[in-house]
Interface confidence: low
């Protein structure tokens, strides 16, 4: 058959929920302290709660069946008879009493025909301000004609006809209803929820709802136009031309910001936005939902997404509706004839409507801020230049911040690329130029997307002009190749001199990507002689170990993961990965990761990897190799080689450098 | 450099009215955000009035609204209060202040006033 | 509306010691999204219009001489020349712009002991 309704399907399980109660027996969620009733989803019973507020189940019967005495649960369905007789069934006896009090209309629902009637409960009768009820009692009870005839239609409507946006043409001067029927299952009535659906009767049917309901005459533009309340709100949809929208047809929902919400922000910031006829579309437009939404239909958190493209979080707790986990909302449903106002206190500025600054304060970047506005760089962050700040996380300043010098200007003028960029546009092997001049290069990994040593480690946020990326760590440009790296370490006198022993300087001067575990002079001197004398003694042994310590790609350990298999110059595969912030190459942790070169990244560690071919099954008594003997055999090999004869002198200082 | 010049003080009857002028040069007028504010003989300073750069947004202190109106003409770069049933407590000097960008901001830049007095 | 207070109402200083006044506002000028402080001071001689000395509680208006420096954040403010030469002789006033009305401390006569 036909798919069913939302409605359908949690009435469908609120008969699954009562069914060991015997047949045709709904569950019911009611509000600890209300008399509110919700037919229950899979959601809402096992959290127990409806907008934050504990529930009690019952157990009652379903729409159209009743109790017979000694028989458990539900099973005889409810004798058919006329509208009126029916509004008494539901429960609806006030809108019977006011329909005598009409005269004319309860020999309409007694008679022939077929009618819809959204039948307010008594207690939405009862809620009624006095001065409402008075006037719709009297004029010889013509509004109270009126008044009821809304609440009919001149056809049978069932839920499963009731769809989301649609309008129903009442029987009073043939004005509109608005019809909102939710993916919860909630149906609402210009706003007002259906409390018991589907109630036939031999003329027609009857729809319990939570509300007395009346005419809507204005559209959302012409509410904003008469009150008061919306006096800056009135101006700024003017200057932005968005009124054409708000008094046009469509569906919307707006989120109407007081003059208190305006109130509430900085002149400065206001204006600012208000100057900006991109800005203030936007921030309009982030005020705006795609589609009409009741308060009625919030029972548990939302996400909706504006027109601006921001999601909003609308909840609700206990009677308040919340925006964002806030009580922002002062004033509730207020029916246009396109669409629905909710009147909001606080402003919902997005962040397409904000500078660098703004951004980064609602991140926690704060630290970087200051260093940025100390710094001296603060106009850039709030000025209309299109940029990207790449800004360092809090945490990454915990064992404090450097002085503000002329190294610190430049290192943080590098953070600021010279484009409005979006992460996902972002490709491996771009380069980014910064404000200092440097260029930056993205390197994108399975899953984690850097710049440089510094990876993305939240999503973006888009300002007017500027885009925030927060990043892991502080970011450091490449200051020369690999070779220029290693030789101006003293860590790696020793590696800088073999790796022009094995003829490598060549490679790792010029472009390219790689990534080089740098083992320091320890772990040279930590080598067993033998396997020293092995490296040493071998021009070409040596260029293979060193190979192996070269990856083809550049992995920074942000982009690491769990385990990256890396493929070395030699052939073989390095085994690299990140386990609690510790990088580790082949099981041994990388003492200092991430010194960033241009052809590549160094990762200095304090041993020297072997080749699986290399590597010694066991490790038997070694010759005690002195440094001399290391030497003889280095000579020995260079009578040999006369590539190595050539490179003897370097041997010979990498031998002195041992003996040290 | 910035220069504002205003004009159109004297002395009125209480529930008069007056038009107070400021003429702009030195710089792009249409661009910035302009100010009213005064202050009575021997006080302190009181702000009055606000204009946006395009003329769209208005903001008056309470002790002025509904009686005083502030303008611009970007095509003669002058700046326009109209004061109406003015009353003792209006009497001060007025100046003209130009604001620091396009935005709403601190008082940049002060005319060197003009005198309203307002007595029977 | 933000009241701004300014104390002391007036203050006496010798030639070339320091001077310090104070302002401080009914509410904090401290606005969290960009971190900046809604104030400003003016400096006001006899027979003169104000003139700016300051804004953002503490960036110094160009031109204005370096004796001359802003400090404070949230609701206290503070105003320092320090060296005090003749021609500062005048009224000094705080001023908030964070909201409407935009409102000035009382001032704080400032004069040679």
């Known amino acids: 058959g036909p798919a069913k309704s939302p409605y359908q399907l949690v009435l469908q399980h609120s008969r699954l929920r009562g069914r060991q109660h015997g047949p045709n027996v709904c569950a019911v969620q009611k509000v600890i302290g209300t008399n509110r009733k919700y037919f229950t989803n899979c959601k809402q019973w096992y959290q127990r709660k409806i907008c934050g507020k504990s529930t009690v189940i019952s157990y009652e019967c379903c729409p159209g069946y009743e109790k017979v005495p000694g028989e458990k649960g539900c099973p005889a369905a409810l004798p058919l008879s006329n509208l009126y007789e029916t509004l008494g069934v539901v429960g609806s006896t006030t809108t019977q009493l006011y329909t005598d009090r009409t005269e004319k209309l309860r020999p309409e629902m007694e008679g022939p025909g077929s009618f819809t009637i959204f039948a307010p409960s008594n207690e939405a009768w009862a809620s009624l301000p006095a001065e409402v009820l008075d006037s719709l009692v009297s004029n010889v009870n013509i509004e109270l004609l009126n008044a009821l005839r809304y609440h009919m239609v001149g056809r049978r409507v069932l839920t499963d006809e009731l769809k989301h946006g649609m309008t129903l043409t009442s029987m009073y001067q043939n004005s509109n209803i608005q019809i909102h029927h939710y993916p919860n299952g909630i149906v609402t009535v210009n706003c007002a929820r259906l409390l018991k659906a589907d109630h036939h009767a031999t003329n027609g049917v009857v729809h319990l709802i939570d509300k007395v309901i009346s005419t809507i005459t204005n559209n959302i533009q012409q509410i904003i136009e008469i009150e008061d309340t919306f006096e800056t709100l009135r101006a700024a949809v003017a200057a932005s031309g968005l009124n054409t929208m708000l008094e046009g047809n469509g569906q919307y929902t707006l989120l109407a910001p007081t003059n208190e919400a305006f109130e509430k922000i900085p002149s400065e910031t206001l204006n600012r936005i208000l100057g900006d006829p991109e800005a203030l579309r936007d921030l309009l437009n982030n005020h705006i939902l795609k589609s009409a939404m009741c308060a009625e239909a919030i029972v548990a958190g939302l996400s909706v997404e504006t027109l601006e493209g921001t999601t909003l979080e609308v909840g609700c707790s206990g009677d308040m509706l919340t925006i964002n986990g806030k009580a922002i909302i002062s004033n509730k449903d207020i029916l246009a004839t396109n669409g629905v106002i909710h009147y909001i206190d606080e402003l919902l500025i997005p962040d397409s409507a904000k500078t660098l600054f703004e951004l980064a304060a609602e991140s926690d970047v704060s630290t970087a801020i200051d260093l940025f506005r100390q710094a001296g760089l603060g106009n850039h962050l709030s000025g209309s230049e299109r940029l990207t700040l790449l800004a360092p996380l809090n945490s990454v300043f915990k064992d404090g911040t450097p002085p503000i010098d002329a190294h610190t200007r430049n290192l943080l003028r590098n953070h600021i690329i010279k484009d409005q960029l979006a992460s996902k546009y972002l490709y491996h092997g771009q380069t980014l130029e910064t404000l200092g001049g440097k260029k930056l290069r993205v390197f994108v990994y399975r899953n984690s997307l850097c710049i440089e040593n510094s990876c993305i480690a939240a999503h973006d946020k888009r300002g007017r002009y500027g885009t925030l990326f927060t990043m892991d760590r502080v970011l450091t440009p490449p200051m020369g190749t690999v070779m220029d790296v290693l030789k101006g370490d003293n860590r790696f006198s020793m590696l800088v001199a073999a790796i022009q022993s094995a003829g490598l300087t060549e490679t790792l001067n010029r472009e390219g990507v790689y990534t080089v575990f740098a083992p320091t002079n320890e772990a040279f001197r930590a080598l067993p002689p033998r396997e020293r004398s092995r490296l040493l003694g071998d021009a070409k042994e040596l260029a293979n170990i060193l190979k192996y310590h070269i990856g083809d790609e550049i992995l920074v350990s942000g982009g690491i993961g769990a385990l990256v298999r890396l493929k070395s110059l030699q052939g073989d595969k390095l085994e690299v990965s990140l386990k609690n912030n510790v990088v580790s190459v082949n099981k041994e942790p990388v003492a200092e990761p991430d010194i960033m070169a241009t052809n590549g990244v160094v990762h200095v560690i304090t041993n020297v990897l072997q080749p699986p071919a290399n590597r010694p099954q066991e490790r038997g008594d070694e010759l005690a190799d002195s440094a001399l003997e290391i030497f003889k055999q280095a000579s020995a090999f260079s009578r040999a080689s006369q590539r190595s004869v050539r490179l003897a002198p370097v041997y010979q200082k990498l031998l002195e450098r041992m003996k040290h | 450099q910035v220069q504002l010049v205003e004009s159109g003080g004297g002395v009125v009857q209480p529930g008069g009215s007056l038009r107070l002028s400021c003429a702009a040069s030195?710089?792009?007028?249409?661009?910035?955000?302009m100010y009213w504010v005064r202050q009575a003989p021997g006080k302190g300073l009181e702000w009055v009035a606000t204009?946006?750069?395009?003329?769209?947004?208005?903001y008056y202190a309470d002790s002025v609204k509904g009686r005083f109106t502030i303008s611009r003409d970007s095509s003669k770069n002058t700046l326009y209060l109209q004061m109406n049933s003015l009353r003792a407590e209006d009497t001060a000097v007025y100046y003209c202040?130009?604001?620091?960008?396009?935005?709403?901001?601190?008082?940049?830049?002060w005319g060197q006033g003009t005198t309203v007095t307002v007595s029977s | 509306d933000i009241v701004m207070t300014q104390s002391p109402d007036s203050l006496a200083v010798s030639l070339g010691e320091r001077a310090t006044m104070n302002c401080k506002s009914s509410?904090?000028?401290?606005?969290?999204?960009?971190?900046?402080?809604?104030l400003a001071w003016y400096q006001q001689k006899p027979g003169q219009p104000p003139k700016l000395l300051i804004y953002?509680?503490?960036t110094r208006e160009s031109g204005v001489p370096d004796r001359f420096s802003g400090s404070g954040s949230g609701t206290d403010f503070t105003l320092t020349i320090s060296s005090l030469q003749a021609e500062d002789v005048a009224v000094y006033y705080c001023?908030?712009?964070?909201?409407?009305?935009?409102?000035f401390g009382q001032g704080t006569k400032l004069e040679i002991k």
């Open positions: 030195g710089f792009t007028f249409s661009d910035y955000y």
């Open positions: 202040v130009r604001g620091w960008d396009r935005y709403d901001s601190w008082f940049a830049s």
């Open positions: 953002w509680a503490s």
């Open positions: 204009i946006s750069d395009g003329g769209i947004y208005k």
């Open positions: 001023q908030q712009y964070y909201r409407y009305p935009y409102t």
């Open positions: 509410q904090s000028l401290l606005y969290s999204s960009n971190q900046k402080n809604y």
